[in-house]
């Protein structure tokens, strides 16, 4: 059928609660595209009827709620004018027993979100709630070891739990609970979070490593399209910004009018000890003015540049 297959990471989910997955694969989905969801290579698309327990909501697939039998591989097909991509998402559903005392309290949360608080600092945890606009998310409550969190040091603000003056006792098993309302029906979302404490300086305290580029020049023909990746490794809990700049200005701002040179959407791959981030710069058409100019990739306090160069003339052609 001419569709390019893309395989996404597995998602491990809790049964009996809502779940949603957004079919986005930048830059494919940034233009005029149609998105259709399927289950297990079925030819019949997932329903778009909002009363259906499983249905497509714009680019999202929405489970209200997720059930035991919903495990499987789901495909979303992104069709553009001249392209077709099929993204495969493997969803695994399992039972969660949060604070059922007969099962012995919270389960092993190794599969759930892991978050870090920085000792002695003011820091925060996030309740990750990814749902389409049709879902209204209600008040969020936070629990530690199954008890609702209260006290001067804790403040629930939007999707975050602000923790002031983090102490070693703040490590442990947390859960955030939100009420989700969709088409007049209410559902409970409960996310488990394993919290560890680190003494290492947070909020950009780490120094990211730019793997590529390496302060070098690239030979490129005038008028061609060029895409250059900036690859960065950084700690999992970093807050460093990664971006491309020219003349000390974000490329998207510098080329705001022409949009000839743009920064891509950042992606990352998670490893055990670190994340590998990729953010590209796209030259839709290389012009004379681009040559000799350092295009800088910034990652926190680290920088690296590329300089475009005209290829040396090939005298063999004469």
């Amino acid at each position: 059928d001419g569709c390019k297959d893309i395989f996404m990471k597995n998602e491990i989910l809790s049964a009996s609660q809502p779940f949603a997955f957004n079919c986005t694969f930048p830059p494919i989905t940034s233009g005029e595209v149609s998105v259709t969801w399927y289950k297990n290579s079925s030819k019949i698309p997932v329903s778009k009827i909002i009363q259906s327990r499983i249905h497509q909501d714009e680019t999202w697939i929405l489970f209200l709620p997720m059930e035991w039998g919903d495990s499987g591989v789901y495909q979303c097909v992104i069709k553009g004018r001249d392209s077709c991509h099929r993204i495969h998402v493997n969803l695994t559903v399992f039972e969660k027993h949060w604070c059922d005392t007969s099962i012995g309290g919270l389960p092993n949360l190794s599969d759930e979100y892991k978050q870090i608080l920085h000792l002695g600092k003011d820091d925060s945890l996030t309740c990750h709630l990814h749902f389409p606009k049709s879902c209204v998310l209600g008040p969020i409550k936070w629990y530690k070891d199954c008890n609702e969190i209260k006290g001067e040091r804790f403040t629930v603000l939007e999707t975050r739990l602000l923790v002031s003056n983090v102490s070693a006792e703040d490590r442990g098993n947390y859960a955030c609970q939100a009420i989700l309302t969709h088409s007049g029906k209410q559902y409970e979302v409960l996310n488990g979070i394993t919290v560890s404490i680190t003494e290492r300086a947070g909020y950009g305290g780490s120094v990211p490593k730019i793997i590529y580029p390496k302060n070098h020049s690239i030979e490129v023909q005038l008028g061609t399209t060029l895409i250059v990746d900036c690859n960065v490794t950084d700690t999992k809990d970093n807050t460093n910004l990664r971006c491309w700049r020219v003349n000390n200005t974000l490329v998207d701002d510098y080329y705001d009018e022409s949009k000839r040179i743009r920064e891509g959407v950042e992606t990352h791959v998670s490893f055990r000890e670190h994340n590998l981030y990729t953010v590209n710069i796209t030259f839709l058409e290389v012009k004379m003015e681009d040559y000799g100019l350092p295009f800088m990739c910034h990652a926190g306090v680290s920088t690296a540049y590329i300089i475009l160069q005209l290829p040396a003339p090939d005298f063999r052609a004469y």
Partner: antibody, heavy 120, light 112 residues
Framework: QVQLVQSGAEVKKPGASVKVSCKAS????????MNWVRQAPRQGLEWMGM????????RLNQKFKDRVTMTRDTSTSTVYMELSSLRSEDTAVYYC?????????????WGQGTLVTVSS | DIVMTQTPLSLSVTPGQPASISCRSS???????????FYWYLHKPGQPPQLLIY???NLASGVPDRFSGSGSGTDFTLKISRVEAEDVGVYYC?????????FGGGTKVEIK
């Protein structure tokens, strides 16, 4: 629709206290923080603190911690902000404000403002 | 406390022309969760402030699309593509990454 209606203007003497009310309607009162922001003449906006009717939780800007008390009356969905030991520099318009939603910040809803004048 | 610094202090713009306001925070407002806790408000005379942009680049409900927000973790820009007479007032940037919530000093925009 969400509405925040504040009490009327007040004139107070230095050293006195003022209690400004903010009556909320159009949403579940106990689900949201109520924030208080003030603007003194020719000055910018200043966040004073916030109050959560669920559990009577107050979070104050340290600048006001000894002088501000926030309370509520759930039966009328009203939050009160009391500022004590008034001085001339407390002359300002006081606003109550609510966030956009429970998960998105930014003050999308504001009271009309209450002018408090402190003068001897 | 996080300090928000706005430039310029005032701006005089011809109707139909673009305008740009900058704001810098003393600490990165980009959280580990990839949300930037940064906001723009417009305070018109005799009215309460109005939310324009939330989380750095999202247009608040009912705000015309001639307004746009962009930036990095510490440097932010509010752009008005074509200024209209109704856009006059004082523009404030704000953060809610952490308590206390803080505002910038304001930028007064007037029409030439």
């Amino acid at each position: 629709q969400v509405q925040l209606v504040q009490s009327g203007a007040e004139v107070k003497k230095p050293g006195a206290s003022v209690k400004v009310s903010c009556k909320a309607s159009g949403y579940t009162f106990t689900n949201y923080w109520m924030n208080w922001v003030r603007q003194a003449p020719r000055q910018g906006l200043e966040w004073m603190g916030m109050f959560h009717p669920y559990g009577d939780v107050t979070r104050l800007n340290q600048k006001f911690k000894d002088r501000v008390t926030m309370t509520r009356d759930t039966s009328t969905s009203t939050v009160y902000m009391e500022l004590s030991s008034l001085r001339s520099e407390d002359t300002a318009v006081y606003y109550c404000a609510r966030t956009t939603s429970m998960i998105i910040g930014g003050f999308a809803y504001w009271g009309q403002g209450t002018l408090v004048t402190v003068s001897s | 406390d996080i300090v928000m610094t706005q430039t310029p202090l005032s701006l005089s713009v011809t109707p139909g022309q673009p305008a740009s306001i900058s704001c810098r925070s003393s600490k990165s407002l980009l959280h580990r969760n990839a949300i930037t806790y940064f906001y723009w408000y417009l305070h018109k005379p005799g009215q309460p402030p109005q939310l324009l942009i939330y989380q750095m680049s999202n247009l608040a409900s009912g705000v015309p699309d001639r307004f746009s927000g962009s930036g990095s973790g510490t440097d932010f820009t509010l752009k008005i593509s074509r200024v209209e007479a109704e856009d006059v007032g004082v523009y404030y940037c704000a953060q809610n990454l952490e308590l206390p919530l803080t505002f910038g000093g304001g930028t007064k925009v007037e029409i030439k």
